[in-house]
């Protein structure tokens, strides 16, 4: 799986979308998990409604919400009031039994609020540094890595 980078502004909401084949994943619940390091386990943050037919209902865990458009094949995760500690690797997953298929790997990056000068030194402004080697910097909310490109396996 390539990793898609989603950039959000501190204090604001960030929406992450994970497209999938609606037929292939028909009847399956979905989940959003946080990966503890690139090779580490993925800890469940929030999952869709226990009844698959009600997957369109938004479910919250703290400041994270999940909703699933099962017909269109798009899982949407909302991170409300984004904070620096929300940065990291995540996965969108499709659940079947005790197994989980990865729909998309996501790197969440937290950018500084350009209007909040108090925290300007504590958060990253676009273009200042990169988490990925040879990554394309795009002025969109998300980008995918090139084929074969991987995140740096960074420090703990």
């Amino acid at each position: 799986h390539n990793t898609t980078v989603f950039q959000g502004v501190a204090g604001q909401s960030l929406q992450v979308s994970c497209p999938y084949d609606s037929m292939k994943h028909w009847g399956r619940r979905k989940a959003w998990c946080r990966q503890l390091g690139e090779k580490g386990p993925c800890q469940r943050v929030v999952s869709t409604h226990n009844l698959w037919l009600l997957s369109f209902l938004r479910r919250w865990n703290g400041s994270t919400a999940i909703t699933d458009d099962t017909l269109g094949g798009t899982l949407t995760i909302t991170l409300r009031n984004l904070q620096p500690h929300d940065a990291g690797l995540y996965q969108c997953q499709s659940l079947h039994g005790s197994e989980a298929d990865t729909l998309r790997k996501v790197l969440v990056e937290v950018l500084a609020d350009p209007l909040d000068h108090r925290d300007a030194g504590d958060l990253w402004f676009p273009g200042e540094s990169e988490s990925f080697e040879d990554a394309h910097v795009e002025h969109s909310i998300s980008r995918s890595l090139l084929e074969g490109e991987i995140p740096f396996p960074p420090t703990s």
Partner: antibody, heavy 120, light 107 residues
Framework: QVQLVQSGAEVKKPGASVKVSCKAS????????IHWVRQAPGQGLEWMGW????????KYAPKFQGRVTITADTSTSTAYMELSSLRSEDTAVYYC?????????????WGQGTLVTVSS | DIQMTQSPSSLSASVGDRVTITCHAS??????LSWYQQKPGKAPKLLIY???NLHTGVPSRFSGSGSGTDFTLTISSLQPEDFATYYC?????????FGQGTKVEIK
């Protein structure tokens, strides 16, 4: 018991090469990144490079590029660090270090260290 | 390379003291900072990962804070076993780089 066991101390002459081994027990090295970090006497820690044993991919600090080679043998769960063209400044304790990579790894294992002395 | 600067380079403190060590990164590193403790002749030991997360088995008197370029390691009440050298390490990009270390000595 989860641990990394390194090979014994080495004494080398300037210009020679040294190869230090790091054997993992209690876990599979394919599930980790293996880093090499060195520490000269009385000095701080210096990251040398890393290998992903699963993919066979390695990456080195610019300072050591061309002089260091990090390899891994998954069949024996052992990682190796070879440093060539040794000079006296390479006298240091060399540590192997395993973690799950960037972005919040909660796993962190270190070898006991291998003293490499470079002296004529 | 990202430069990591620790301060102070050494400090003397007594058992029970509150100790604070700072680490400054030359570039933004978000929260990708770890703190290690090292005792003479031993390998480093992870204390804090992701700037503020306590590693398994580390006493709660250790805490970390910060994001971006400025980070702090705090020992709320120094214990005899805490006298050691502490290093910060950035994990935003390669090469990984360490601070020069802070030696905590007995006053």
């Amino acid at each position: 018991q989860v641990q990394l066991v390194q090979s014994g101390a080495e004494v080398k002459k300037p210009g020679a090469s040294v190869k230090v081994s790091c054997k993992a027990s209690g876990f599979s090295i394919e599930d980790f990144y293996i880093h090499w970090v060195r520490q000269a006497p009385g000095q701080g820690l210096e990251w040398m490079g890393w290998i992903d044993p699963e993919q066979g991919e390695s990456k080195y600090a610019p300072k050591f590029q061309g002089r260091v080679t990090i390899t891994a043998d998954t069949s024996t769960s052992t990682a190796y660090m070879e440093l060539s063209s040794l000079r006296s400044e390479d006298t240091a304790v060399y540590y192997c270090h395993a973690d799950h990579g960037n972005y919040g790894s909660t796993m962190d294992y270190w070898g006991q260290g291998t003293l490499v002395t470079v002296s004529s | 390379d990202i430069q990591m600067t620790q301060s102070p380079s050494s400090l003397s403190a007594s058992v029970g003291d509150r100790v604070t060590i700072t680490c400054h990164a030359s570039q933004h590193i978000n929260v990708w900072l770890s703190w290690y403790q090292q005792k003479p002749g031993k390998a480093p030991k992870l204390l804090i990962y992701k700037a503020s997360n306590l590693h398994t088995g580390v006493p709660s008197r250790f805490s970390g804070s910060g994001s971006g370029t400025d980070f702090t390691l705090t020992i709320s009440s120094l214990q005899p076993e805490d006298f050691a050298t502490y290093y910060c390490q950035q994990g935003q990009t390669y090469p990984r780089t360490f601070g020069q270390g802070t030696k905590v000595e007995i006053k």
